[in-house]
């Protein structure tokens, strides 16, 4: 699995609506793949985690000045949606076919 | 400053081309305010850091399994232009107004 | 190597016209902004127009002084810049250089024609 | 339009001495840290060529000797130690707005 010392990339990551308090009204699925961005943005920053030109520069001035200036970040660049029943104000079951920013497409130093 | 128990903000960063050996090829301004985010992600992530559902999930995911799971990072959300003079291909010194993704704009927790 | 050449200036009385044509060789004309610059005799320099990129719609603009009188003009593909000047005017008498380069800076100069308007 | 004034409009300077020419403009030319100056030398019989630009740098193929310093609307151009090539007349430009124009020139002699 992609810890600290490993590049920025996509790792797997489990939610359980339960435990974030969301089965309240959330009815299905009970878990979904959240993904997770996992990993340093070590220089040089490669392609594949698709650096603006801000984050090649404080990955520069970090190289320069490690304890001034933190490294990028890896985050979700690119999000997904997912799809949920839940219950509506009136607590009927409704079907959300594109819910949103849930789940984590693609990852990329920020 | 913003260090790590702040909220995640935009704080200074002056960056001198010299220093990430830009001056090669930048030949104004020599340095530039970059900004950077810092700062924590932290629960309850509040709208000024205008979290993703991503964002919020693995904040919760995190308060509930903090070994497991990071909290979301404070990262560059928004970035504006500088402009910048460089010689072109035949050594003319050109003027570039809008050189993209170079500063920060807005600061975020995704 | 960079060159400019303008054509051969001359001698026009006041009121008259006279086209100034500039050939440019050694850099890729299509990609640099097109100026004329004069210095009227023993006198300083004075911008007289340019003409930005195909990009902008080849935009041009004209000192005060020239304006409504003066256009300028260019052909990329034959890598000419043109200067038609009507109404001549006494004072309009110099060398007229044509000069390339940038939104920044006149990087390259012609060797400059002499127009001369006298009656 | 902004207005460029340079000072001396003459200078006689001997060989191997130092030269100074001033250029003062009518309002900033500095905009996103970038000073839109330049500096040209123009020999008799000669087209103008590019010695300074963005205040301080230097064009290519231009001596050592040659600098430029200033920002804002106070600029200087400097020759460090006078050649008899250096023999010339010196023109600063500026390019922050168009009409983009030009001191009135210094003409620089050998004394």
């Known amino acids: 699995s992609a810890g600290a010392g490993s590049h920025c990339q996509k790792t797997s990551l489990r939610v359980n609506f339960e435990d974030i308090g969301w089965d309240s009204w959330i009815i299905a699925p009970k878990e979904y793949e959240a993904y997770e961005c996992k990993g340093g943005c070590f220089f040089p920053l490669a392609d594949d985690v698709t650096p603006t030109k801000h984050a090649i520069v404080q990955t520069l001035v970090h190289l320069k000045f490690p304890t001034k200036v933190g490294k990028a970040c890896c985050v979700p660049t690119k999000l997904s949606p997912i799809s949920v029943l839940y219950k509506d104000d009136m607590g009927v079951p409704t079907l959300k076919y594109h819910y949103e920013g849930m789940s984590v497409a693609e990852c990329g130093c920020r | 400053s913003a260090g790590a128990g702040s909220h995640c903000q935009k704080t200074s960063l002056r960056v001198n081309f010299e220093d990430i050996g830009w001056d090669s090829w930048i030949i104004a301004p020599k340095e530039y305010e970059a900004y950077e985010c810092k700062g924590g992600c932290f629960f309850p992530l509040a709208d000024d850091v205008t979290p993703t559902k991503h964002a919020i999930v693995q904040t919760l995911v995190h308060l509930k399994f903090p070994t497991k799971v990071g909290k979301a990072c404070c990262v560059p959300t928004k970035l504006s232009p500088i402009s910048v003079l460089y010689k072109d291909d035949m050594g003319v010194p050109t003027l570039k107004y809008h050189y993209e993704g170079m500063s920060v704009a807005e600061c975020g927790c995704r | 190597e960079v060159q400019l050449v303008e054509s051969r200036g001359g001698l026009v009385q006041p009121g008259g016209s006279m086209r100034l044509s500039c050939a440019a060789s050694g850099f890729t004309f299509s990609n640099y902004w097109m100026n004329w610059v004069r210095q009227a005799p023993g006198k300083g320099l004075e911008w007289v127009a340019h003409?930005?990129?195909?990009?902008?719609?080849?935009?041009?603009h004209y000192a005060e002084s020239v304006r409504g009188r003066f256009t300028i003009s260019r052909d990329d593909s034959k890598s000419s810049v043109y200067l038609q000047m009507n109404s001549l005017k006494t004072e309009d008498t110099g060398i007229y250089y044509c000069t390339g380069g940038s939104n920044y800076v006149f990087a390259f100069w012609g060797q400059g024609t002499l127009v001369t308007v006298s009656s | 339009d902004i207005v460029m004034t340079q000072s001396p409009d003459s200078l006689a300077v001997s060989l191997g001495e130092r030269a100074t020419i001033n250029c003062r403009a009518s309002?900033?030319?500095?905009?996103?840290?970038?000073?839109?100056m330049n500096w040209f030398q123009q020999k008799p019989g000669q087209p103008p060529k590019l010695l300074i630009y963005?205040?301080?740098n230097q064009g290519s193929g231009v001596p050592d000797r040659f600098s430029g310093s200033g920002s804002g609307t106070d600029f200087t151009l400097t020759i460090s130690s006078l050649q008899a090539e250096d023999v010339a007349v010196y023109f600063c430009?500026?390019?922050?707005?168009?009409?983009?124009?030009f001191g009135q020139g210094t003409k620089l002699e050998i004394k």
């Open positions: 003409i930005r990129l195909k990009s902008d719609n080849y935009a041009t």
């Open positions: 963005a205040a301080s």
């Open positions: 309002e900033s030319v500095d905009n996103y840290g970038i000073s839109f």
């Open positions: 430009q500026q390019s922050k707005e168009v009409p983009w124009t």
